[in-house]
């Protein structure tokens, strides 16, 4: 039994960020005379939270009128709680003096702030990679409390297992951050694929937050090249076609070379998309056979997405006497990159 007891009935109070927190405190006696003050923390470094007599505490209001006669309720309400408000709050009775003397402290009420995690931000690799390569995606979310949190990765709805996740700091803090890295093996079919980082936390009431990244930002699908020649036309012109297929992204430059000299350069633009998200492009070159004495070496050179150029070359054999109109050509493959046309 004591002359004066300072009663803080709740050991802990949990409040959602943005809400108000009520910290309860009653005293068993108003004697001896002296103020009640609220502090966060204990010891010499404690922070004054509320003092009726002096100071400006815009977010703190007394629950009961402290100037009312016989008022023994010194509870306070703190508005617009943020994670920075977390801590243990003490209601302390002082005895009037010069200076006032601390008489009795309440047992303290621990205020924990339930703060929602920020929307997960997923970032992919800085440079694109091709199929069969592994790329890393990073997911970050900040500002949540309490520390317990669940993070999962999905690719096209399937959970990923090659994941490393850290929550910081390891010790006690007003709020926490999570960072997770997922490793994904790319396939040529991943242009339309998506990775999702899903964060579940007590503050989200079963409705997790999701961050997404499109593998289209991370993948490069190199093109296939095929060069073909149509029948020789009556005007001794040969129509040579360079088919560039199944590539992504669209950024592609095609150059025709005749005997090593640039004939024409084209940039791909506004191409229709294949079902799998890749693109196809066909370029034609008309070669006037009668204008050449010697064989013509044609090269289709493709530079895709800043990568080293890929070539397909073939030779057009210039005949001593002109072909009959409409005759077919026979092609013999003399190498992976060269075709001779007779």
């Amino acid at each position: 039994e004591e002359e004066l007891q300072v009663i803080q009935p709740e050991k802990s109070v949990s409040v959602a960020a943005g809400d108000s927190a009520t910290l309860n405190c009653t005293v068993s006696s108003l004697i001896p005379v002296g103020p009640i003050q609220w502090f966060r923390g204990a010891g010499p470094g404690r922070e004054l939270i509320y003092n009726l007599k002096e100071g400006h505490f815009p977010r703190v209001t007394p629950v009961s009128d402290p100037t009312k006669r016989n008022n023994m309720d010194f509870s306070i309400r703190i508005s617009n709680i943020t994670p920075a408000d977390a801590g243990t709050y003490y209601c302390v009775k002082f005895r009037k003096g010069s200076p006032d003397v601390e008489l009795k402290s309440g047992a303290g009420t621990e205020l924990s702030v339930r703060a929602k995690p920020s929307a997960p931000v997923v970032s992919g690799p800085a440079v694109r990679a091709t199929a069969e390569h592994t790329v890393s995606f990073t997911c970050e979310s900040h500002g949540f409390s309490p520390r317990d949190i669940t993070l999962k990765w999905f690719k096209n709805g399937n959970e990923l297992s090659d994941v490393q996740t850290n929550v910081d700091p390891a010790g006690k803090s007003v709020s926490y951050s999570i960072r997770s890295t997922a490793r994904v093996v790319l396939t040529r079919r991943d242009v339309h694929s998506q990775v999702i980082c899903e964060v579940a936390h007590v503050t989200l009431q079963g409705d997790p937050l999701r961050g997404t990244a499109n593998l289209s930002e991370a993948i490069r699908v190199p093109p296939f090249l095929e060069v073909t020649q149509q029948s020789m036309r009556a005007d001794n012109q040969v129509n040579v076609t360079c088919q560039v297929t199944k590539f992504y992204p669209q950024r592609l430059q095609l150059t025709w070379l005749e005997n090593g000299n640039v004939s024409r350069t084209e940039m791909a633009s506004a191409l229709p998309e294949n079902k799998d998200g890749t693109y196809n492009w066909t370029s034609w070159l008309l070669v006037n056979v009668s204008a050449h004495r010697d064989d013509v070496k044609l090269t289709c050179q493709v530079e895709h997405d800043g990568q080293p150029a890929v070539n397909k070359s073939f030779s057009v054999k210039v005949s001593a006497h002109p072909k009959e109109q409409g005759s077919n050509t026979a092609a013999e493959n003399t190498g992976t990159n060269e075709r001779n046309i007779y």
Epitope: E2, S29, L30, I31, I36, P66, T67, R69, G97
Partner: antibody, heavy 114, light 111 residues
Framework: QVQLQESGPGLVKPSQTLSLTCTVS????????VNWIRQPPGKGLEWIGI???????DYNAALKSRVTISKDTSKNQVFLKLSSVTAADTAVYYC????????WGQGTTVTVSS | DIVLTQSPASLAVSPGQRATITCRAS??????????MHWYQQKPGQPPKPLIY???NLESGVPARFSGSGSGTDFTLTINPVEANDAANYYC?????????FGGGTKVEIK
Amino acid sequence: QVQLQESGPGLVKPSQTLSLTCTVSGFSLTGYGVNWIRQPPGKGLEWIGIIWGDASTDYNAALKSRVTISKDTSKNQVFLKLSSVTAADTAVYYCARAGKMDYWGQGTTVTVSS
Amino acid sequence: DIVLTQSPASLAVSPGQRATITCRASESVDSYGNSFMHWYQQKPGQPPKPLIYLASNLESGVPARFSGSGSGTDFTLTINPVEANDAANYYCQQNNEYPWTFGGGTKVEIK
């Protein structure tokens, strides 16, 4: 129940030190303060001082230079020492519990006389 | 020091009548929304007995015939109706500022 009982010599010579004991029961001296109050014959009450539960003290400035209040919590006793007494210190001395003075001892009469 | 002046110094009242004692402080005894003024009854040969604390609160076991009022510097103790065993000295006391002080007392006699 709460009880306070003053004890000490009824007669003290001038210039000597008056020493009184207040023995308490029914409450803890760590949780409650104890006051000393005196009442000269036929006069009003005068507050001497208080020793708080934490053993800190507050005294009447008019007597402060001569007063010491202490306690032995384990024995449930509070002590008053008043030095350099004169006839003006003749009074009934009371101890009373806490800032509220809600319980009083019966008082002990001290006469200062040679 | 806060000086407490009680009036009247003495008062004779018939049983069943109202007795009113006033206590004026030389400065306010109010702090933190409360008046740190208390009233005691003392009968000859006995220690003071607490009646009222914080200006208007009745101590446990004290009859409701006793009441207190006032704030700041002016306080009143009322006994209504007075009974024969109310004959005693009545003291006001403040513990808002050191040194704690008592009024000079009011002697209530029953006619």
